[in-house]
């Protein structure tokens, strides 16, 4: 049996809402809106699976489908990282990986996807309807986030397939991806929308297949374009909160990334750029890549296996890659 985490079905406005504007005039803003929202936008997918061999452990997989290069991945649970979620792991392609209990193994699967295994026992263990979110910071697309959860009815060993239209928050939908034509179209669209703002907004219909489907602050031009139109943000109800949430410091960050260099619109310096950077004792992680990344939450330091701080004498480079945490 496969279960699926659903995103609300976004309905187009009712035909009666067209009013005096006319069908032809109304179609143009919808087309422009679709272009503005989807042009050059990548996609993030999230999978959550309860392992059949270890019924108390979860595997979370996240991937970025875009042509850009990933510069940071943040995995959180209980909601998006900047909205009450608690950071489970932060993965950086050069500085390595840091994870917090109950995360057992965070690793790069590929250059654009990661996986995280969660321990299921103990007070901080996840439960079946916990929401897990992955945020990818990439160049040049910007920062993208998607969330997913495994419904309580899921069979062990099966995963909830990624939602057809992932729950996404675009901090910047393509730094370099919007052409002048599209920009003009978007401005024109805004002009049209302002001109006709007295019209009632289209209704949002909750998904018929998911009684607990969240309400999304977005609307789509048509059912046909749903697959391409990304919902900017949605909150998922979860009845299970991590036990360690109260101990989190939402405004702090991984202390060993306190002094990440800022680099605007270019790929990182050579492979040795941060190889010898000492790991600071404390500090606040300030996002790089033109300030696109949200801060990653930090908990009090752990000395157990949940904390990974480059034991390899060759530094963080030895920790990187699909091998993940040694």
């Amino acid at each position: 049996m496969r279960t699926e985490a659903q995103v609300p079905a976004l309905q187009p406005p009712e035909p009666g809402l067209e009013g005096a504007m006319g069908h032809r005039t109304l179609v143009l803003p919808w087309v422009l809106l679709t272009l503005c929202v989807t042009a050059g936008t990548p996609e993030v997918w999230v999978q959550v699976r309860m392992e059949a061999t270890e019924l108390s452990s979860f595997t979370i997989r996240c991937g970025f489908l875009g042509s850009g290069s990933i510069s940071l991945v943040t995995v959180s649970w209980g909601g998006p990282n900047g909205a009450g979620g608690t950071t489970l792991a932060v993965l950086h392609p050069e500085r390595g990986i840091r994870q917090w209990a109950p995360a057992r193994q965070a690793r790069w699967e590929t250059q654009s996807s990661i996986s995280l295994i969660l321990e299921g026992s103990g007070a901080s263990s996840p439960c079946a309807n916990t929401t897990f979110c992955c945020k990818f910071a990439s160049f040049p697309e910007g920062s993208w986030e998607a969330c997913g959860s495994l419904p309580p009815s899921s069979d062990p060993g099966l995963s909830a397939p990624p939602t057809p239209a992932p729950i996404l928050r675009a901090d910047l939908a393509g730094i370099l991806g919007v052409s002048g034509v599209l920009l003009f179209g978007c401005v024109y669209l805004l002009h049209l929308l302002r001109r006709h703002k007295h019209r009632p907004a289209p209704r949002l219909q909750p998904s018929r297949t998911s009684p607990q489907a969240p309400r999304a602050r977005a609307w789509a031009p048509s059912q046909a374009s749903q697959a391409a139109l990304h919902v900017p943000y949605a909150t998922i109800n979860t009845s299970c909160r991590p036990a360690t949430l109260d101990t989190a410091h939402p405004h702090g960050g991984p202390s060993w990334w306190a002094s990440l260099p800022t680099h605007a619109a270019h790929r990182p310096q050579g492979p040795a750029a941060w190889a010898s950077t000492p790991i600071p004792a404390r500090g606040s992680f300030v996002s790089v890549e033109n300030g696109l990344y949200a801060q990653a939450g930090e908990r009090p330091p752990h000395t157990g296996p949940g904390l990974t701080l480059f034991p390899d004498p060759r530094g963080p480079r030895a920790m990187e890659g699909p091998l993940g945490v040694r």
Epitope: W45, Q47, P93, S112, R267, P268, G270, E320
Partner: antibody
């Protein structure tokens, strides 16, 4: 058309150094990791590690730490494998292999393979 | 390291026969991370099946893959002469990536 074209065969003496190139075409080079795989004559495949083509960071399994190095010439969409202080047991065919993007159906596979470079180490 | 054991090491089949080869892992491998490659003599390997059961581009539909946990298999429903090759399984459940020793398929 996506392809990985490797440099030609090489004959070396023990103690020398060999550098194999792998030129990628048909895709965005810095989006996919590049792995290297060794196949000794009549033997199976052995993974040598991979390099992140965006960050330039290399990862090696224990068996290939020390004498082996990966490098990049991003502007030429080319990856390199260098083996220092060659030994007889390094005689093999070496493949570069693109690390697949990863998807909801799988990850950690090599979706495009290079043409292979045979290195013979003999005194 | 996870050790992958392939059996049989060599097998032969006549055109039209159904063929199954297996790959046994020393510890559990998630289906996401189990893949198969085909390598013909003197050629580079090719991705054949990824994520246990997904056929790579251009692979004939007579091939299929299945399995879970520590036991996986590749099946050819009706073998053809062009299928003669060595087939390797590969895992990436835990580091490092490892390959099986291969099953060589000969066509009678």
């Amino acid at each position: 058309q996506i392809q990985l074209v490797q440099s030609g065969p090489d004959l070396k003496k023990p103690g020398e150094t060999v550098k194999i190139s792998c030129k990628a075409s048909g895709y965005t080079f810095t989006t996919y990791g590049m792995s290297w795989v060794k196949q000794a004559p009549g033997r199976g495949l052995k993974w040598m590690g991979w390099i992140n083509t965006y960050s330039g960071v290399s990862t090696f399994p224990d068996d290939f730490k020390g004498r082996f190095a990966f490098s990049l010439e991003t502007s030429a969409s080319t990856a390199y494998l260098q083996i220092n202080n060659l030994k007889n047991e390094d005689s093999a065919t070496y493949f570069c292999a693109r690390l697949g993007m990863g998807s909801t159906t799988g990850a950690g596979y090599f979706d495009v393979w290079g043409t292979g470079t045979t290195v013979t180490v003999s005194s | 390291d996870i050790v992958l054991t392939q059996s049989p090491a060599i097998m032969s089949a006549s055109p039209g026969e159904k063929v199954t080869m297996t790959c046994s892992a020393s510890s559990s491998v998630s289906s996401w991370y189990l893949h198969w490659y085909q390598q013909k003599s003197g050629a580079s390997p090719k991705l054949w099946i990824y994520g246990t059961s997904n056929l790579a581009s251009g692979v004939p539909a007579r091939f299929s893959g299945s399995g879970s946990g520590t036991s996986y298999s590749l099946t050819i429903s009706s073998v053809e002469a062009e299928d003669a090759a060595t087939y390797y399984c590969q895992q990436y459940r835990s580091d490092p990536y490892t390959f099986g020793s291969g099953t060589k398929l000969e066509i009678k």
